[in-house]
């Protein structure tokens, strides 16, 4: 699978539960982590830090206790436990630890992991809430005007909302620049899309739409293969054995499989 | 302990300056002042420190306008860049200088990065297809204000237009529907008082004129035996073709 | 004050490329766009395109897409045009000037003394 | 792209006369931002281009108040109060509301 480099993580889970969020700070030698929960509308707020050398959490004042548990699997890696999960506990959840770079000072800045959305609910979902892909190839009127071709990838019916879309090229980690739109709620699932103009050199590469979203088989991430386009002119061969549709549009099967 | 950011969102055209004012509490007299960004991805990143104890600091575009008597920290940043738009918070830290400090934050304040204003510029308009999907793709227009319209006699479902800032710093914009009848869709576009329709810039091609995928040696390639030299697709239903994953 | 020094005059042949220098004092070179402009011998003003040096952002006239490459080195608050594939229709004076942002005027204020270029073979 | 429309072609005027030339474009030059990006040019002969007006009617610092621009929407006017030697040259009404930018064809303004 390819490698997404930090952002977007979302766990979610329902009500009475319990969830992990991992820190994904790679930090040797921290002291103390803290945990930091980030609520839309309000104030980040800090809600304990674990002692590392002491192995004990030390929570703010008016958490009941039982609450949260920094569980350390091996070292210099922490897993936030909470328990007993209300919607309330939905949000944004970051560890953070204290790096002294400056040795003249007592401390220097806050670093703060790349955070996890926590997702409280009860609703009734379907069982596969992945991102359905639908691909959409360049217009031939853009190729011929514009000497460059945009691609469309159009993710539906995917739970929760957090999500995170990149292009690359087949052969290259490059992630290349695109737009998206926002995410849209469609009745209790989302929607987004993504696009990619390429000039038309790039056209006959193949491009990936790569899609990271807690609910991908497997746990990695969607890969979505664009084909080269070709736009030259040729003869059609009355030979060619591919499948075309009433109208003329050739259905391609794409197996859904990351590396 | 109390951090106050009250603006909560601010608009600014790139290459201007932006000041992002933040009022804090407390009886500390030796303590430090962060200013983090959280990008969309909520990511949070830290940008600067201030010092109660020292000048005004500064570190490249970002710059601290710090009055101690008046407990206003305010963050500068200078020759705005798209890639600014992001929520900014502003933090006390303890004076302890211990590692057991937390910051105490403000409710932050969202940095919209806007295009300068610029020569208006009429959009180009493409449609692409897939089954029952509709895109209509809206390019590199000047001013924001646009109306998108696909129209079709058998909507099933249209969704609101996504306009976002392009590379050059105009906009783009993407309209998408579902339609019984997609082949006949056809897109048009209000902005500044004309109107363009996406049939404008339909090439006019013979029926010798194709794209077809181009051979490619990926394992990823579809299942169907449709991925060699001779699949062949009609240039004009090039952006309709279907790939169910 | 400001200025904006063009480099001389070109001849080149048909075919070839050419590349035209502006050098600009006086002012914060990274803060303004830098226009370019073609005035074919007794015609009229023609804008090629722009390019601002904070970022190197460019827009072109359509008509000159793939002719001019705008380009700009801000450790010698220069700027650049390239031309291609040169003919006889290119044959021109070239001025570049300096363009104040929209938000204040969006006029371009200063100009350089204008390059000649003559294609011939 | 948008079409400046310059008249007269050229003008003939005596110094210390006033002098008038017209500039209509082929739309409204009101950009979004409520400013008309309408700028007046002179080039005298055998130099570069020189800034007199910008948005319709704002002389730029250095020119003389002898010069007045006035207009909206898609109709502008540039006025000499009294022609002086040193204002000939052709005049050349410029556009920047719309992309690209475009110049009328120029009015020559020559000593009777």
């Known amino acids: 699978s390819s490698n997404l480099e930090g952002g977007t993580k979302s766990v979610t889970r329902p009500t009475r539960s319990s969830a992990e969020i991992t820190c994904d700070l790679t930090v040797i030698n921290a002291f103390y982590i803290h945990w930091y929960l980030h609520q839309e509308g309000k104030a980040p707020q800090r809600l304990l830090y674990y002692d590392v050398s002491n192995s004990k959490d030390v929570l703010e004042s008016g958490l009941s206790p039982g609450k949260y548990y920094t569980h350390t699997p091996r070292r210099w890696s922490w897993i936030l436990i909470l328990r007993n999960l209300i919607e309330n506990d939905s949000g944004v959840y970051y560890c953070a630890t204290w790096d002294r770079g400056n040795p003249k000072t007592h401390y220097y800045k806050k670093l703060f992991g790349s955070g996890t959305t926590l997702v409280v609910t009860d609703k009734q979902l379907d069982a596969d809430v992945s991102p359905k892909p639908t691909i959409f190839l360049p217009s031939i009127a853009e190729t011929k005007l514009q000497k460059a071709g945009t691609y469309l990838c159009l993710l539906e019916k995917f739970f929760p909302d957090v999500i995170k879309i990149h292009w690359q090229e087949k052969k290259s980690n490059t992630i290349l620049g695109s737009q998206e739109g926002n995410t849209m709620k469609t009745n209790d699932t989302y929607m987004k899309f993504s696009w990619l103009t390429v000039p038309e050199k790039s056209l006959d590469k193949e491009h990936r739409c790569i899609v990271r979203h807690e609910n991908n088989k497997n746990g990695v991430d969607q890969e979505i293969i664009f084909p080269p386009i070709k736009t030259d002119v040729i003869t059609m061969d009355p030979k060619d054995n591919c499948s075309k549709d009433a109208n003329d549009t050739l259905l391609l099967q794409l197996t859904n499989t990351s590396a | 302990q109390k951090v106050t950011q009250a603006q909560s969102s601010v608009s600014m055209p790139v290459r201007k300056a932006v000041t992002l004012n933040c009022l804090y509490e407390t009886s500390w007299w030796s303590y430090y002042i962060f200013w983090y960004k959280q990008l969309p991805s909520k990511e949070m990143i830290f940008l600067i420190r201030q010092g109660s104890d020292e000048q005004n600091a500064k570190s490249g575009r970002y710059s601290v306008n710090f009055k101690k008597a008046a407990k206003s920290v305010a963050l500068t940043i200078s020759a705005l860049q798209l890639e600014d738009s992001a929520k900014y918070f502003c933090a006390l830290g303890d004076p302890g200088g211990l590692n057991t400090d937390k910051l105490i934050f403000g409710k932050g304040t969202r940095v919209t990065v806007e295009p300068r204003s610029q020569p208006h510029t009429k959009p180009s308009v493409f449609v692409m297809k897939n089954g029952t999907n509709v895109a209509c793709l809206v390019k590199e227009f000047y001013p924001k204000d646009i109306r998108i319209n696909l129209v079709s006699s058998k909507k099933i479902t249209e969704f609101d237009p996504a306009i976002v800032i392009s590379p050059s710093g105009k906009y783009n914009a993407v309209k998408l529907g579902k339609y019984e009848d997609s082949n006949s869709v056809t897109c048009s576009v209000q902005h500044d008082n004309k109107t363009v329709h996406s049939t404008d810039f339909e090439v006019k091609t013979d029926s010798t004129d194709h794209v077809k995928p181009k051979e490619t040696e990926n394992t990823k390639q579809p299942s169907k035996s449709c991925h060699k030299p001779k699949a062949i697709v009609h240039t004009e239903k090039v952006n309709m073709m279907s790939l169910t994953v | 004050q400001v200025q904006l020094q063009q480099s001389g005059p070109q001849l080149v042949k048909p075919g070839a490329s050419v590349k035209l220098s502006c050098k600009a004092s006086?002012?914060?070179?990274?803060?303004?766009?830098i226009n370019w402009v073609k005035q074919r011998p007794g015609q009229g003003l023609e804008w090629i395109g722009w390019?601002?040096?904070?970022?190197?952002?460019?827009d072109y006239n359509g008509k000159f897409k793939g002719k001019a490459t705008l380009t700009v080195d801000t450790s010698s608050s220069s700027a650049y045009m390239e031309l291609h594939s040169l003919t006889s229709e290119d044959s021109a004076v070239y001025f570049c000037a300096r363009m104040d942002d929209y938000d204040d005027g969006g006029a371009m204020d200063y100009w350089g003394q204008g390059t000649s270029v003559t294609v011939s073979s | 792209d948008v079409v400046m429309t310059q008249t007269p072609l050229t003008l003939s005027v005596t110094v210390g006369q006033p002098a008038s030339i017209s500039c209509k474009s082929s739309q409204s030059l009101l950009h979004s931002n409520g400013k008309t990006y309408l700028n007046w040019l002179l080039q005298r002969p055998g130099q570069s281009p020189k800034l007199l007006i910008y948005l319709v009617s704002k002389l730029e610092s250095g020119v003389p108040d002898r010069f007045s621009g006035s207009g909206s929407g898609t109709d502008f006017k540039l006025k000499i109060s009294r022609v002086e030697a040193e204002d000939l040259g052709v005049y050349y009404c410029?556009?920047?509301?719309?992309?690209?930018?475009?110049c009328g064809a120029g009015t020559k303004l020559e000593l009777k």
């Open positions: 410029l556009q920047a509301t719309h992309f690209p930018l475009t």
């Open positions: 006086g002012y914060t070179f990274t803060s303004y766009d």
């Open positions: 390019i601002y040096p904070g970022d190197g952002t460019t």
